[in-house]
Interface confidence: medium
């Protein structure tokens, strides 16, 4: 139902949902710190522009009695309960930050008259695509899917001379929230990825995955999975792998590959890692001292959500426009704003664009090296290492189907 907004007369409030069920198991205190750091920057920027207004955040906590799984499984009702709480207290701000779970975001979007913008650090699933007042500040599944199709089709690079049209997808149901929705998108029969591939099979058991590694009758040489190197090792161990197997390991929110003195373990030699271009911005930040590389991205998304609101507030106030209007609610897209870590670009549907990086393990140096980058904003691949020292024959990626000639 319609809730009055605390969003006028020079006082602008941000409603931050602090849900027990979250895309990443992050202490709420860290997210509070991220929000507060963002508020300090926003206040300064507004003051700096000669706009003497007040900006605050209200943290809305659920009681945690009913919805306490800690992951996203019971988030649907928790999100609606929090919205009810906001409605009863008449405490809605100009913008809603959170939730991060796809289930809760989807349901909240359906069940509310969204005359206010909603900013999410997460909501990775395809069901949250193309929502007119939803902005997502962590790479959603659609962006991953577009990269994979683009990469599969590529056949004009020195290290990739075959188009691919097949894949196995390993999905055993224990994935983290981001991985769950990334793999869910690849599995969905109606998705762009499925539509563009001629063959795709989901492997759900560890043994299925392990058997494929040396199966002479396999239908594809390419296996997509999601997680970190340790996750792969638990599954693969030191098992022998056929020489033309390529494992694509999706591990977007993990900076560890770029840290100094990181050596790639031997079991990563058949693996291409897809991750995001790294950031070092939060290492010295007051709220990030105890964050792992993955959690840094999550906290940063909360901080950037505050900065995005500040950016839009500044524009509307400078133009003398009302904040509590559909125009404001629909404005959080197709723009670039100054995030904490540098410029942040949102596409036409309010989803963050980024530079994805595909890494390989150099057989010479045992280091992770950048093979190519991909700009999600323009859906374009940029080769970086034209002469990679691959484990694969002739330092080229193999065909996706054994024995098939050049495409």
């Amino acid at each position: 139902s319609q809730v009055s907004q605390n969003c006028h007369n020079g006082s602008y409030e941000i409603s931050v949902l602090m849900m027990g069920n979250s895309a990443f198991a992050e202490p709420l205190k860290n997210l509070e710190d991220a929000v507060n750091e963002g508020l300090e920057i926003v206040r300064g920027r507004l003051q700096n522009a000669g706009l003497n207004v007040t900006v605050n955040a209200t943290f809305m906590y659920s009681d945690g009695l009913i919805h306490n799984s800690g992951d996203c499984r019971s988030s649907t009702c928790e999100g609606l309960d929090l919205l009810r709480k906001i409605s009863n207290a008449q405490r809605m701000g100009c913008v809603l930050i959170g939730p991060s779970c796809t289930y809760s975001t989807f349901q909240m979007y359906l069940d509310t008259e969204l005359s206010y913008p909603m900013i999410s650090a997460g909501s990775f699933g395809l069901s949250c695509d193309y929502k007119e007042t939803l902005t997502r500040l962590m790479s959603p599944a659609r962006k991953l899917m577009y990269f994979l199709v683009n990469f599969w089709k590529t056949n004009d690079l020195p290290f990739k001379t075959y188009s691919w049209s097949t894949s196995y997808v390993y999905k055993n149901g224990t994935e983290t929230e981001d991985c769950f929705w990334y793999l869910n998108a690849l599995e969905a029969s109606v998705s762009y990825f499925s539509h563009e591939l001629g063959f795709k099979v989901v492997l759900r058991q560890d043994k299925e995955f392990q058997d494929i590694l040396m199966d002479h009758n396999r239908k594809s040489n390419v296996i997509i999975m999601c997680g970190g190197p340790e996750f792969l090792y638990k599954l693969k161990g030191d098992r022998a792998v056929a020489e033309d197997i390529v494992i694509i390991l999706v591990d977007l929110f993990n900076d560890q590959y770029f840290e100094d003195n990181v050596t790639a373990p031997d079991y990563m030699k058949n693996v291409l890692v897809l991750t995001l271009s790294p950031g070092n911005s939060l290492l010295n930040s007051s709220f990030s001292r105890n964050l792992s590389p993955t959690k840094r991205d999550f906290a940063l998304a909360y901080l950037n959500g505050i900065l995005l609101f500040g950016h839009m507030l500044k524009i509307f106030l400078e133009n003398g426009e009302n904040i509590t209007t559909p125009k404001f609610a629909h404005a959080f897209r197709n723009l670039t704003f100054e995030g904490y870590d540098g410029p942040v670009t949102l596409d036409d549907w309010g989803d963050v664009d980024s530079t994805m990086v595909l890494l390989y393990t150099s057989v010479d140096t045992k280091k992770y090296k950048v093979l190519l980058t991909y700009d999600t904003h323009v859906n374009k691949t940029y080769p970086v290492d034209m002469s990679p020292t691959f484990t694969w024959k002739n330092s080229k990626l193999p065909n996706d189907i054994t024995g098939r000639g050049p495409q």
């Epitope: 920057i41 003051q47 911005s281 010295n284």
Partner: antibody, heavy 119, light 107 residues
Framework: QVQLQQWGAGLLKPSETLSLTCAVF????????WSWIRQPPGKGLEWIGE???????NDNPSLKSRVTISVDTSKNQFALKLSSVTAADTAVYYC?????????????WGQGTLVTVSS | EIVMTQSPATLSVSPGERATLSCRAS??????LAWYQQKPGQAPRLLIY???TRATGIPARFSGSGSGTEFTLTIGSLQSEDFAVYYC?????????FGQGTNVEIK
């Protein structure tokens, strides 16, 4: 208390490359843009460009093809290189810090380095 | 690029008098404007940002006003240490740009 200390060659010949470094002491290095601004003798201030801890750069199109700005976060330093200098590049060069993150006005300045280009 | 124009180029004022300096932008900068003071041999010093907000430690005799394209810096009662060159600067867009300066000298 934040302090900016800058250094570099003061006398150059035409066509050489100007090279200046600015070190930041005290305060946070991340969370700010760090700028280079110059002032020819007896004239006004000209903004050259800026960089943040991540290496994101904004620079002045009038100098863009000759300017390189870089950052070394491990040393809390940033640097300016200006190639193919001429007498018109003779100026006092200042490094400066914004008042806050991405604010565009400058509350901390280096001491300035006079760079003279002469054959 | 936004061009900033200051007037007058030189302003002669007696100590204790009021000084009024003008700055005009070639297009709107809303209130994204700063004023600096510079003395010979020194780096500029930030006086005003946001068109009218005094920076930390700046005396109350300095005040800024204006928005859009027309701005004014007023020095209420000139002290001996106020004789210097004053610059305006816009930070609405890149590249940042400064005015050519107004020299406030003793009359």
């Amino acid at each position: 208390q934040v302090q900016l200390q800058q250094w570099g060659a003061g006398l150059l010949k035409p066509s050489e490359t100007l090279s200046l470094t600015c070190a930041v002491f005290g305060g946070s290095f991340s969370g700010y843009y760090w700028s280079w601004i110059r002032q020819p003798p007896g004239k006004g201030l000209e903004w050259i460009g800026e960089i943040n801890h991540r290496g994101n750069i904004n620079d002045n199109p009038s100098l863009k093809s000759r300017v390189t700005i870089s950052v070394d976060t491990s040393k809390n330093q940033f640097a300016l290189k200006l190639s193919s200098v001429t007498a018109a590049d003779t100026a006092v060069y200042y490094c400066a810090r914004e008042r806050g993150y991405s604010f565009g006005n400058y509350d901390h300045w280096g001491q300035g380095t006079l760079v003279t280009v002469s054959s | 690029e936004i061009v900033m124009t200051q007037s007058p180029a030189t302003l002669s004022v007696s100590p204790g008098e009021r000084a009024t300096l003008s700055c005009r932008a070639s297009q709107t900068v809303t209130r994204n404007l700063a004023w600096y003071q510079q003395k010979p041999g020194q780096a500029p010093r930030l006086l005003i940002y946001g068109a009218s907000t005094r920076a930390t430690g700046i005396p109350a005799r300095f005040s800024g006003s204006g928005s859009g394209t027309e701005f004014t810096l007023t020095i209420g009662s000139l002290q001996s240490e106020d004789f210097a060159v004053y610059y305006c600067q816009q930070y609405k867009s890149w590249p940042r740009s400064f005015g050519q300066g107004t020299n406030v000298e003793i009359k």
